[in-house]
């Protein structure tokens, strides 16, 4: 015998209290598949979460994060704060990148500057907290008659050493 509830479409539930009639989901609830015996409560996007998609009778609300935060986890279950370029998120909040490292995004960690000398190249543009160094042509390319040139060390700020 076919289950009468299987005829209830998405957006309804099979109401046992009313002879298994298909009843519409109450306000602020939904059923995304047919044959459901209950409707699920809609997710509420509150506080640092904001509504990206309103709940309907057939689909849950979807949240994202307010400006200054970004989503983490399945379905944006968490909001993590953004940092500025030149910073990384630590356990104690946003902190500037240490000398010799950079971050060009609002999330993620500070990464070491490229070591141009490893590729036999020179530093064309010094690195900053926000930007990686730009490597130029190899010193040999700049002095055509030279047979061997020791690549210069990466540029450093005076009085600083990499941390």
């Amino acid at each position: 015998l076919q289950d009468p509830c299987s005829n209830c479409p998405a957006g309804t539930f099979c109401d046992n209290n009313r002879n298994q009639i298909c009843s519409p989901c109450p306000p602020n609830s939904f059923s995304s598949a047919g044959g459901q015996r209950t409707c699920d409560i809609c997710r509420q996007c509150k506080g640092v979460f904001r509504t990206r998609k309103e709940c309907s009778s057939t689909s849950n609300a979807e949240c994202d994060c307010t400006p200054g935060f970004h989503c983490l986890g399945a379905g944006c279950s968490m909001c993590e704060q953004d940092c500025k370029q030149g910073q990384e998120l630590t356990k104690k909040g946003c902190k500037d990148c240490c000398f010799g490292t950079f971050n060009d995004q609002k999330r993620g960690i500070c990464r070491p500057w490229t070591n141009c000398s490893l590729d036999g190249k020179s530093v064309l543009v010094n690195g900053t907290k926000e930007r990686d160094v730009v490597c130029g042509p190899s010193p040999a390319d700049l002095s055509p008659g030279a047979s061997s040139v020791t690549p210069p060390a990466p540029a450093r700020e005076p009085g600083h050493s990499p941390q």
């Epitope: 990384e88 356990k91 104690k92 960690i109």
Partner: nanobody, 124 residues
Framework: EVQLLESGGGLVQPGGSLRLSCTAS????????MSWVRQAPEKGLEWVSS????????FYADSVKGRFTISRDNSKNTLYLQMNRLTAEDTAVYYC?????????????????WGQGTTVTVSS
């Protein structure tokens, strides 16, 4: 599959205590540092506490120092957070989180797996 399952949340009065648990599976628990991170209703994620893989090193956010205690039982693959002298500011969803290495500190934010969270509400 790596999984973290929190429990122990609930409604508690100001000044009360709760103990959160997090059961881990799918990885060698003792090889990794673990953390508790919380999200209050109006705020972003806030790191609460971390513990090294062996349990020998623990770290706390200033806001919970002296009130919360993190511990772990590696034989049971379980992480704990004992929360005492709770205040309304501790109301949040508390997430158990796996760090990417055995060691930990109170600086590097190195989380690669999150639990589903357990809700703690402190209200009279």
């Amino acid at each position: 599959e790596v999984q973290l399952l929190e429990s122990g949340g609930g409604l508690v009065q100001p000044g009360g205590s709760l103990r959160l648990s997090c059961t881990a599976s799918g990885f060698t628990f003792s090889n990794y540092a673990m953390s508790w991170v919380r999200q209050a209703p109006e705020k972003g994620l806030e790191w609460v506490s971390s513990i090294s893989g062996s349990g020998g090193s623990t770290f706390y956010a200033d806001s919970v120092k002296g009130r919360f205690t993190i511990s772990r039982d590696n034989s049971k693959n379980t992480l704990y957070l004992q929360m005492n002298r709770l205040t309304a500011e501790d109301t949040a969803v508390y997430y158990c989180a796996k760090e990417g290495s055995n060691g930990t500190d109170d600086y590097h934010y190195d989380i690669d797996v999150w639990g589903q969270g357990t809700t703690v509400t402190v209200s009279s």
